[in-house]
Interface confidence: medium
């Protein structure tokens, strides 16, 4: 049971994470214009990865498009990537993930097979939530550098402060929700690593424990649903079942009624 | 090119109201505040108050509130003002402005209103 | 309300003068001031913006400074078309406040 709630609660921890990395990186609001001693008739200007934007003092926005690719720093193409590649790996994690869900059942899918999964979606999470983490933190950091710059330069000159005032940028609300969704996705993803654990079959072999009763012999696996039914011979303590023990969460191989609940 | 094109002269009496008209060509009419600003005959420039065509959003001087009633029709791009209550000392040329930033970058010509018993 | 104070009131100099006209606000406005001219019977024009900044079509003769509380406009090299009544105002905060103005005039 607990490690269905581990494996549930990773995948929708980790797809709150994901739809956070979608949403920040659609988001126009990852750098935003320093607002101090602004004037109230001010511009306010704020930037995305895709476009950036300019709201009126009115309140009318307008948004242009950054048609232009080479034109571009390398920085915040190196953003985009880090955040494409987080959400393509978010996106195939969670695909995988679905399948791997102990409460969903795909014909006679081994728990083995299951484990596996929900490895490979925990580590594309992993993954996924550290790309996410490491491109807004590029980003962070190369708005912490400028803003410093832009505020040496406005006083430095001859008589004090330069006269053409930089705009200067700081954080928008998409770098908190990049760094929140981040780190969603990664925990969901340790969440559903940790779940793998409890899923993955363990290597140690039950033996059998023989009942002699009228001249054959039924061997019964402790907590399990084989049973080997032999005659004559078969009185010795054998290995009935070699497959590797399943854990008590286990679920028949074959339907039951508590399949599809 | 933008333009802001004002209403006629006004001659009114002491007592009534008044209300001219700027319309807005060359820009988006939503987009920028239209400024109002009052210029009495040979002396400095006085703010008035501001309407947001965007909102619907009116900000008076506090010397002018109760005074001046600022609107607008977007559909004709228009803004108007409205001064209630005349004496000689509304007598002024009253311009509208379109401000960018701080600065008004493009003035109407001006509506000369006269009060005069 | 910030209060404008421009001075001299009235300026007479000859051409080819440099004339500087200044603008003391009560209270911090950083560089959010503009200054402009106005001909008798005219509307008044956009010179400087952003303390500093010439406005597009502006002859480079003039020219602003000053943030905070303090700024000037300067004009190099008096022109016959530059006599005319100079307005500073800041943008700072509402309600927008205009100096008094500055009527330059010819010697």
């Known amino acids: 049971m607990a490690v269905t709630a581990c494996q549930g609660l990773g995948f929708v921890v980790s797809l709150i994470g994901i739809a956070g990395i979608i949403a920040a990186t659609c988001m126009d609001q990852w750098s935003t214009q320093d607002l101090y001693n602004n004037p109230v008739t001010a511009v306010f200007n704020y930037q995305g990865l895709w476009r950036s934007c300019v709201r009126e003092s009115s309140g009318f926005t307008e948004c242009r498009g950054y048609f232009t690719l080479l034109g571009l720093p390398a920085m915040l193409q190196a953003v985009r990537a880090l955040m494409i590649v987080g959400i393509v790996l978010g996106a195939i994690g969670l695909l995988v993930s679905i399948f791997a869900l102990k409460c969903i059942r795909i014909g006679s899918m081994e728990d083995s097979a299951k484990a596996n999964m929900t490895l490979t979606s925990g580590i594309m999470f992993i993954v996924s939530g550290l790309c996410a983490i490491a491109g807004v933190s590029v980003f962070a950091n190369m708005l912490v550098t400028n803003f410093w710059m832009s505020t040496a330069n406005m006083y430095t000159g001859m008589g004090g402060m330069v006269q053409t005032v930089q705009t200067r940028y700081t954080f928008g609300a998409a770098l908190f929700v990049g760094w929140v969704a981040g780190g969603l996705t990664l925990i969901g993803g340790v969440m559903m690593c940790i779940a793998c654990r409890g899923l993955a079959p363990e290597e140690t072999n039950y033996k059998a424990v023989s009942y002699h009763a009228s001249g054959h012999s039924v061997a019964y696996k402790p907590g399990g649903f084989k049973a080997s039914t032999g005659f004559g011979s078969n009185t010795k303590n054998k290995k009935i079942y070699d497959g590797g023990a399943r854990t008590e969460d286990e679920v028949q191989s074959y339907p039951s009624k508590h399949d599809y609940v | 090119e933008v333009q802001l094109q004002q209403s006629g002269p006004e001659l009114v009496k002491p007592g009534a109201s008044v209300k001219m008209s700027c319309k807005a060509s060359?820009?988006?009419?939503?987009?920028?505040?239209i400024h109002w600003v009052k210029q009495k005959p040979g002396q400095g420039l006085e703010w008035i108050g501001y309407?947001?065509?965007?909102?619907?959003?009116?900000k008076n001087n506090e010397k002018f509130k109760g005074k001046a009633t600022l609107t607008s029709d977007k559909s004709s791009s228009t803004a108007y003002m409205e001064i209630s209550s005349l004496t000689s000392e509304d007598s002024a040329v009253y311009y509208c402005?379109?401000?960018?930033?701080?600065?008004?970058?493009?003035w109407g010509q001006g509506t000369l209103v006269t009060v005069s018993a | 309300d910030i209060q404008m104070n421009q001075s001299p009131s009235s300026l007479s100099a000859s051409l080819g003068d440099t004339i500087t006209i200044t603008c003391h606000v009560s209270?911090?406005?950083?560089?959010?001031l503009s200054w402009y001219q106005q001909k008798p019977g005219n509307i008044p024009k956009l010179l400087i913006y952003?303390?500093?900044n010439l406005h597009t079509g502006v002859p480079s003769r003039f020219s602003g400074s000053g943030s905070g509380t303090g700024f000037t406009l300067t004009i190099s090299s008096l022109q016959p078309e530059d006599i005319a009544t100079y307005y500073c105002?800041?943008?700072?905060?509402?309600?927008?406040?205009f100096g008094a103005g500055t009527k330059l005039e010819l010697k």
């Open positions: 309407f947001n065509p965007y909102n619907d959003d009116s």
């Open positions: 060359g820009y988006t009419f939503t987009r920028y505040i």
């Open positions: 105002q800041q943008g700072q905060s509402y309600p927008l406040t």
């Open positions: 402005a379109k401000l960018r930033q701080e600065r008004i970058a493009y």
């Open positions: 209270q911090n406005i950083d560089v959010w």
């Open positions: 952003k303390a500093s």
